[in-house]
């Protein structure tokens, strides 16, 4: 969370940002709100990245100004225009890519004052684990599997009734990479599983962790699996 | 409210360029990009090319080498140049615009040209 | 280049039937898929926008859903003003691509 203050005058408006992470692929958001501030055609919100000539996306006088769009972001930015009123400063960017990442800055003027605030984006590839009982293999074992994972993860087993066992001799882990070159299919084996417990399958990088459960009784296989983003709030 | 009208179609014998302007409306181009897509008589759409607010373009692999796009914001004009123009050229024309800055689909089109490569 | 493959190619239904024509693009392409109303001699007409928003001054009667690959037109209940050709769009990526497009006859 990174609160920006500025001044014009005897007037300073709170900007608000949140550094969020980027699913390569898919679309983003990147969060910014400021003191509401009714009167709309007097609202500039401008976008900036550093390092980048021109802007990421402006907004002013009610409506998009793209005219000095830095060429990167052509066709993939827009604010959420009807919540502009309500301090909402936010920017949606299509098609993430990895190149996205770096420090963006939100300023914005009102009637009230200016004010900016930074934000750092990270980007990268992350995914939920889905794990299932591999039927094929010689010995009961469970298969981990994430679909899209970048930079590269570690990926760690744990169990409910072997707690702080080392699962890493008894499991083998594969990364194979995707059709674009850049994300990776995430594979792991776990061996010689027993009945009537509760595996865990737990991917991380620097940008997420995800954690894939299996409980294997003799009546039933449970399952379930969540995602954190990580440095994010 | 929003307008876009094609105009500079006609007949063009094979070899010679074509050019087209597309005069907007109803909003600035400084705020949306314009889409050229065209159709072949009794075909499907075809996508050609994109200019953005920026000035900026993006065209369609397979008629990079042909295509030119200019605008000029003070005349709300967008111009679309193609040549070495052949028969399967032959194709309604339209410019288009985005129902949003991010491209979720085309929402205003143009009432379309008529282009007729025939010598 | 992404491929839209829109089926059927076409489709007789009745006034007041409900109708579904499906879209499978060739790889991923979120929620950027859009559908297009045509009738002969005149320029397509947005219905679907982002999937599943439907355009301003579009009837309830259609709706669209989808994400990923696999993306679906419905019309709840046909209106004689419906037949016409109907066409999906992909945004996602350059260059950007529609379906050969599916014919919607008066039974």
């Known amino acids: 969370l990174i609160i920006g203050f500025g001044i014009s005058g005897k007037h300073f408006i709170t900007v608000t940002t949140f550094t969020s992470a980027g699913n390569i692929g898919e679309d983003g958001t990147l969060s910014c709100t400021f003191e509401p501030d009714i009167k709309l055609n007097g609202i500039v919100i401008q976008w900036l990245k550093e390092g980048i000539k021109g802007l990421v996306h402006e907004f002013k006088e009610g409506k998009d100004d793209l005219s000095q769009q830095h060429e990167m972001f052509r066709g993939r930015t827009a604010v959420f225009a009807d919540q502009v009123v309500v301090g909402n400063a936010s920017l949606r960017l299509k098609n993430v890519q990895l190149t996205d990442a770096g420090t963006y800055t939100c300023y914005i003027r009102t009637s009230k004052g200016k004010g900016n605030a930074n934000l750092e984006y990270k980007t990268g590839a992350f995914s939920m684990p889905e794990i299932n009982v591999d039927y094929n293999a010689s010995s009961e074992s469970l298969r981990c599997e994430a679909p899209r994972w970048f930079p590269q993860p570690t990926v760690a087993w744990a169990s409910q009734v072997d707690q702080g066992a080392n699962f890493s001799e008894v499991s083998n882990t594969s990364f194979e990479l995707n059709s674009e070159n850049v994300t990776m299919k995430v594979v792991s084996v776990l061996y010689n599983v027993t009945i009537n417990n509760t595996y865990s399958c737990m991917i991380e990088n620097d940008i997420a962790k995800a954690t894939g459960d299996i409980k294997v009784t003799d009546s039933e296989v449970k399952r379930r699996s969540q995602l954190q983003l990580l440095n994010s709030g | 409210q929003v307008q876009l009208v094609e105009s500079g179609g006609g007949v063009v014998q094979p070899g010679r360029s074509l050019r087209l302007s597309c005069a907007v409306s109803?909003?600035?181009?400084?705020?949306?990009?314009v889409q050229w897509v065209r159709q072949a008589p009794g075909k499907g759409l075809e996508w050609l090319a994109v200019?953005?607010?920026?000035?900026?373009?993006d065209y369609n692999a397979a008629f990079l080498s042909r295509l030119t796009i200019s605008k000029d914001n003070s005349k709300n004009t967008v111009y679309f140049q193609m040549n070495s123009l052949r028969a399967e050229d032959t194709a309604v024309y339209y410019c288009a615009r985005d129902v949003t800055t991010i491209v979720e689909g085309f929402a205003h089109w143009g009432q379309g040209t008529l282009v007729t490569v025939s010598s | 280049d992404i491929q839209m493959t829109q089926s059927p190619s076409s489709l007789s239904a009745s006034v007041g039937d409900r109708v579904t024509i499906t879209c499978k693009a060739s790889?991923?392409?979120?929620?950027?898929v859009s559908w297009y109303q045509q009738k002969p001699g005149k320029a397509p007409k947005l219905l679907i926008y982002?999937?599943?928003n439907r355009y301003t001054g579009v009837p309830s009667r259609f709706s669209g859903s989808g994400s990923g690959t696999d993306f679906t037109l419905t019309i709840s209940s046909l209106q004689p003003e419906d037949f016409a050709t109907y066409y999906c769009?992909?945004?996602?990526?350059?260059?950007?691509?529609f379906g050969q497009g599916t014919k919607l006859e008066i039974k």
């Open positions: 982002g999937a599943s």
């Open positions: 790889e991923k392409v979120g929620t950027y």
């Open positions: 200019i953005w607010s920026s000035g900026s373009t």
């Open positions: 769009g992909q945004t996602y990526s350059y260059p950007f691509t």
């Open positions: 109803g909003f600035s181009l400084t705020s949306y990009g």
